[in-house]
């Protein structure tokens, strides 16, 4: 597989119509949450939360500030942190709690706190809950979270020093967390989390699962330097912890290595940057797209690999485990475990088979199963990408975030369109055409070439947008700039599945944005402009 060529078209910031939102003296617009039914985009920034019109983000609807008291700032500074940059409240969690409220957490000058934001009054309820384990202390530390049925699942660091990683569920009746142990989480950098719902008519009566994606330091590969490994981990929503062993800890936490490499060249992409779960009516199981860079990235390489969720499920449900063994007194080696596996299977969700055997909850699981999963959280089998190779490899660029849209071209062909942002404020649009990936467009979203920190895709029919957050603000861009292609040739050569040439109006129009019939429109994804 060759490196993806340079983008066919580059739009400079001033050349295209981009809608922007930023407020004076407000920075770090890194938390974005879209409410499609309300046509509202919620933005979490440093010491502030905004609600803006999702169709035109320059229209601010509401704002609320959550500042740190001078006393808190002083205490934070006493501990050696910067009063100007670190001892502030960076909003890190912005999750829907109900139709009328959001759950918001911030670093709060190294004393993480959470609150409920009433969407009607757009005021905080003043709950001031302890945010430890839900939100990082340090704005520089990694974090991820997802709200599942009113309970927050988070991956972050639990302590001030940032040395104690945790994947937890914040729940009034059944809070759970990972063991604080190196084999469970080894200096992870959390990237993404999401829930995958089991279909209601699932024959095995299986549980919903929450997946976590992170990069961590390998325990299984021994080199002179620290080897980073991308991981996919999962827990079961119904997990209630163990009765004695793993009390208030996950009994279903398992993790596996994500493979993204180019075998022919020995290129290994082992630092996970972002993940997007693609759900589509045409997909039986979700596909997740993961964005990677190599560990030693002096040439600016980035790659995208796509994975079937069923491949990951297979590893967790039927794969072999890894075991830590001691050699020469106390030296550790990780090897494939070939011994007997207890029943019920360690780390498995409670399904109808388990229930039939009278294991109705993780609290009923036998000690053997619990002890095994406590000692064997790592799978020996790896999760391999679709087609066993990356979808995209790009040189001289550091990609930061990814979103993917599945769209249908005029001829009925379905394309997965990848929107990938860079550390220089650009957005690349890439698709697979004739077994090769083409970057059909590059748009400079941010004038100051700053890294894109967050990328969000609207899924509502009609007005479709990509939203990008950076340190200085948020930018809203349409999925395509069809109108910029002034001739039929340009429109066809763009090879953009969202665009087609309309001979009656002599314009390049956006498909799926109008209800008008597509008869007579010209689109040739092969780029053959002779049809014009």
């Amino acid at each position: 597989m060759a490196f993806a060529p340079i983008p066919r078209i580059t739009w400079e910031h001033r050349e295209v119509h981009l809608v922007q939102f930023h407020e004076p003296d407000i920075y770090n617009y890194s938390a974005l949450l879209l409410s499609e039914d309300k046509d509202t985009l919620y933005i979490g920034a440093r010491e502030a939360v905004f609600a803006v019109n999702a169709l035109n983000i320059s229209e601010k609807q509401h704002e609320v500030y959550w500042k740190v008291s001078e006393d808190k700032k002083a205490k934070c500074a006493e501990k050696g942190k910067s009063k100007q940059t670190e001892c502030l409240n960076y909003i890190r969690v912005l999750q829907p709690l109900s139709a009328t409220s959001l759950y918001v957490c911030g670093t709060n000058a190294f004393q993480p706190a959470c609150d409920h934001l009433n969407l009607t009054s757009f005021k905080f309820l003043g709950k001031n809950e302890d945010g430890k384990g839900r939100c990082p202390f340090d704005p520089a530390h990694s974090y991820t979270s997802v709200m599942v049925d009113g309970e927050l699942y988070s991956g972050t660091s639990y302590n001030f020093l940032g040395s104690e990683p945790i994947i937890s569920r914040n729940s009034s009746h059944s809070p759970l967390r990972t063991e604080y142990a190196i084999p469970w989480l080894n200096e992870p950098s959390f990237v993404f989390a999401d829930v995958i719902r089991k279909s209601p008519d699932s024959p095995d009566g299986e549980d919903d699962r929450v997946y976590f994606f992170f990069t961590e330091v390998s325990v299984e590969y021994e080199f002179v330097f620290r080897v980073l490994i991308p991981r996919i981990a999962r827990v079961c929503k119904g997990d209630q912890g163990g009765l004695r062993t793993l009390q208030k800890k996950w009994t279903s936490f398992l993790k596996a290595r994500l493979i993204c490499s180019r075998p022919d060249s020995g290129l290994v992409f082992n630092v996970l940057r972002d993940v997007f779960v693609l759900r589509s009516p045409g997909l039986k199981v979700p596909v997740f797209y993961a964005l990677f860079t190599p560990q030693l990235n002096n040439v600016g390489l980035s790659a995208v690999c796509a994975y079937n969720l069923s491949t990951a499920e297979e590893v967790f449900s039927h794969g072999k485990y890894m075991q830590s063994t001691t050699v020469e007194q106390s030296h550790t080696k990780w090897v494939r475990y070939n011994g007997p596996v207890p029943k019920p299977r360690p780390g498995a969700c409670i399904d109808s088979e388990a229930r039939a055997a009278n294991y109705t909850s993780s609290l009923n699981l036998p000690d053997k199963t619990l002890q095994f999963v406590k000692d064997h959280p790592l799978m020996d089998d790896s999760v391999t990408p679709i087609d066993n190779r990356p979808r995209l490899i790009k040189k001289d660029v550091n990609y930061t975030q990814i979103v993917v849209d599945r769209t249908q071209a005029l001829d009925g062909t379905v394309y997965d369109v990848m929107f990938v942002s860079t550390d220089r404020g650009a957005l690349h649009k890439a698709i697979s055409l004739e077994h090769a990936v083409h970057i059909i467009e590059e748009t400079q979203l941010f004038q100051d070439f700053e890294p894109v920190q967050t990328l969000l895709l609207s899924s509502k029919k009609g007005n479709r947008f990509v939203y990008a957050g950076s340190n200085s603000g948020v930018v809203q861009a349409p999925l395509a700039f069809c109108g910029k292609h002034g001739t039929c040739e340009d429109c066809v050569l763009a090879r953009d599945p969202y665009c087609a040439w309309s001979p009656p109006t002599a314009t390049c129009v956006a498909l799926h944005q109008t209800e008008s019939p597509s008869r007579g429109l010209i689109q040739e994804m092969s780029g053959d402009a002779s049809v014009c």
């Epitope: 302590n159 809070p175 604080y180 080894n186 001691t326 106390s330 030296h331």
Partner: antibody, heavy 118, light 111 residues
């Protein structure tokens, strides 16, 4: 059995440095964090810092930043703590301790006495 | 930092009698229903030895005359029937928040 064996007592001059070792045996060294705790004569216990043996990532009590440097040698399953710019108030017994899953120090070294005297 | 204050500083109890040591934290050491409070015993010239972890769990090999209780900010170590070998200094320690901190110690003697 699980054991932590520390290096012997040291007498040092003010301004000098000392490196205390802690050799682990009887368990997977890489699976557990190693911590250091000090006890000044007739005083209580003070947590100094910790290290992750697989990564060498250390974190410190703010009070001991710049004073203590914690390292590991995985090949010999040994943790080290170096104390620099020694002063008389650094005279103490220094312990290494394994930090167990339940967030407690379940195994301790026998202690190394460091005496700083001119 | 969380300050741990033990009381009393020293305690003299007759053999066979109950000994109680208290420990108060300057803020809660609980997280999601777990109390991250540990108790250690230290005899002269020896390193500390773990007795109780997570407020009330007895470390294996420790006699069951030792027990721990409490949550939030107030914790207690109880020796139900004092034995001669229990003469030592006892420390409480919180591991909920770094820097991990110890109490000043309680010296237990025989009356």
């Amino acid at each position: 059995q699980v054991q932590l064996v520390q290096s012997g007592a040291e007498v040092k001059k003010p301004g000098s440095s000392v490196k205390v070792s802690c050799k682990a045996s009887g368990y997977s060294f890489s699976d557990y964090y190693m911590h250091w705790v000090r006890q000044a004569p007739g005083q209580g216990l003070e947590w100094m810092g910790q290290i992750n043996p697989t990564t060498g990532g250390a974190s410190y009590n703010q009070k001991f930043k710049g004073k203590a440097t914690i390292t590991v040698d995985k090949s010999t399953s040994t943790a080290y703590m170096e104390l620099s710019s020694l002063r008389s108030e650094d005279t103490a017994v220094y312990y290494c301790a394994r930090y167990y899953y339940g967030r407690h120090f379940d195994v301790w070294g026998q202690g190394t006495t460091v005496t700083v005297s001119s | 930092d969380i300050v741990m204050t033990q009381s009393p500083d020293s305690l003299a109890v007759s053999l066979g009698e109950r000994a109680t040591i208290n420990c108060k934290a300057s803020q809660s050491v609980d997280y999601d229903g777990d109390s991250y409070m540990n108790w250690y015993q230290q005899k002269p010239g020896q390193p500390p030895k773990l007795l109780i972890y997570a407020a009330s769990n007895l470390e294996s090999g420790v006699p069951d005359r030792f027990s721990g209780s409490g949550s939030g900010t107030d914790f207690t170590l109880t020796i139900s029937s004092l034995q001669a070998e229990d003469v030592a200094v006892y420390y409480c320690q919180q591991s909920n928040e770094d820097p991990y901190t110890f109490g000043q110690g309680t010296k237990l003697e025989i009356k």
